[in-house]
């Protein structure tokens, strides 16, 4: 969490941002909140990006003002116009690109004063893994697949029964470049699995960590997966 203040004493307002991550090719949100004002027409929101000459987005007098918007953000940004009055300056960003990563500034002017806060935005690719029993294999084998990751993640297998065991000798992981030549499909195979055990396939890079669990018994197979973004810090 980053909390920024205006420069001059009583004419400063609090602006709060949260560091976040964007999934390339998907839509993202850059979070920013501020002390609200009574009149929408008195609020100015400017989003800026370090190293970019034009603005990322500008909202003033109750509407967007895109005359100074940088070409790389054309047609890709929006604020939640109906929520500005309650202090939400968050930015919706369409079709996140690797090049969108960097330091952003949320700069606010209201009748109470000015304030700003920076936000670190990471970009990459992350997706939920799915673990299945590979019935085509000669021995009991599990196959963990996740369609889109970048940068290249690490893959670690774990088991509920054999806690702390190292499965690197009995697993094989491959990375296949997707058609857009950036993200990769992750496939990891675990051999010699036993029934009545829960196995976890953990995929992690510096942006996200995802886990796919599978419990195999003689009567059923249960699956569960979850994904967590790393380093979401507020400012």
């Amino acid at each position: 969490l980053i909390i920024g203040f205006g420069i001059s004493g009583r004419h400063s307002i609090t602006v709060t941002t949260v560091a976040s991550a964007g999934n390339i090719g998907e839509d993202g949100i850059l979070s920013c909140t501020f002390e609200p004002d009574i009149k929408l027409s008195d609020i100015v929101i400017q989003w800026l990006k370090e190293g970019v000459i034009g603005l990322v987005h500008e909202f003033k007098e109750g509407k967007d003002e895109l005359s100074e918007q940088d070409e790389m953000f054309r047609g890709r940004t929006a604020v939640f116009a109906d929520q500005v009055i309650v202090g939400n300056a968050s930015l919706r960003l369409k079709n996140v690109q690797l090049t969108d990563a960097g330091t952003y500034k949320c700069y606010i002017i209201t009748s109470k004063g000015k304030g700003n806060a920076n936000l670190e935005y990471k970009t990459g690719a992350f997706s939920m893994p799915e673990v299945n029993v590979d019935y085509n294999a000669s021995s009991e084998t599990l196959r963990c697949e996740a369609p889109r990751w970048f940068p290249q993640p690490t893959v670690v297998w774990a088991s509920q029964v054999d806690q702390g065991a190292n499965f690197s000798e009995v697993s094989n992981t491959s990375f296949e470049l997707n058609s857009e030549n950036v993200t990769m499909k992750v496939v990891s195979v675990l051999y010699n699995v036993t029934i009545n055990n829960t196995y976890s396939c953990m995929i992690e890079n510096d942006i996200a960590k995802a886990t796919g669990d599978i419990k195999v018994t003689e009567s059923e197979i249960k699956r569960r997966s979850h994904l967590q973004l790393l380093n979401s810090k507020a400012s």
């Epitope: 998907e26 839509d27 895109l66 005359s67 054309r74 047609g75 929006a78 369409k94 079709n95 857009e180």
Partner: antibody
Framework: QLQLQESGPGLVKPSETLSLTCTVS??????????WGWIRQPPGKGLEWIGN???????YYNPSLKSRVTMSVDTSKNQFSLKLSSVTAADTAVYYC????????????WGQGTLVTVSS | EIVMTQSPATLSVSPGERATLSCRAS??????LAWYQQKPGQAPRLLIY???ARVTGIPARFSGSGSGTEFTLTISSLQSEDFAVYYC?????????FGGGTKVEIK
Amino acid sequence: QLQLQESGPGLVKPSETLSLTCTVSGGSIKSGSHYWGWIRQPPGKGLEWIGNIYYSGSTYYNPSLKSRVTMSVDTSKNQFSLKLSSVTAADTAVYYCAREGSYPNWFDPWGQGTLVTVSS
Amino acid sequence: EIVMTQSPATLSVSPGERATLSCRASQSVSTNLAWYQQKPGQAPRLLIYDASARVTGIPARFSGSGSGTEFTLTISSLQSEDFAVYYCQQYHSFPFTFGGGTKVEIK
């Protein structure tokens, strides 16, 4: 409510320049949250996005037409214009102007469209 | 550019029946998709944006769903005024592109 109206010649000779103007009424072309776009539809076919312009004059064109397209805006007249050079019979279409959301980038409302035929 | 493919090209439905129109993108467009209705001699009219958000004034019988590459426009109970051509449009990346259209005709 906002209305758009295309105007311009209905017949253009091959190799010449097609020129159309869209007049916006019931609202200002300076509406900051919108671009102003052109879309065309050849007879009996689908829709093709030509490009858009912001009230400040910044433009974005469809790469397939970029070398031949020029758009301009006249805020004092609440109008924006399209020029398409070196036309051929393949450019025969109904040309629509429309308001385009800055994001989400929908088109609404549209002008009623004007048929431009390219023929000698 | 992203290619949008609509199916079927023609859909024959009786009034009061349900119509399901499909739109497929050549690559993921997230939920950055709009649907339009066009009647003969008229300009298209926006029905749905962001894949599922219905425009103010559009009847509730029109609904959109989907994300990524597969999208659906559903008309729950066709009225006589709904027989028209329907187009999907992606605005995920430039250039914006439209599908070839689905004509909904009276059976």
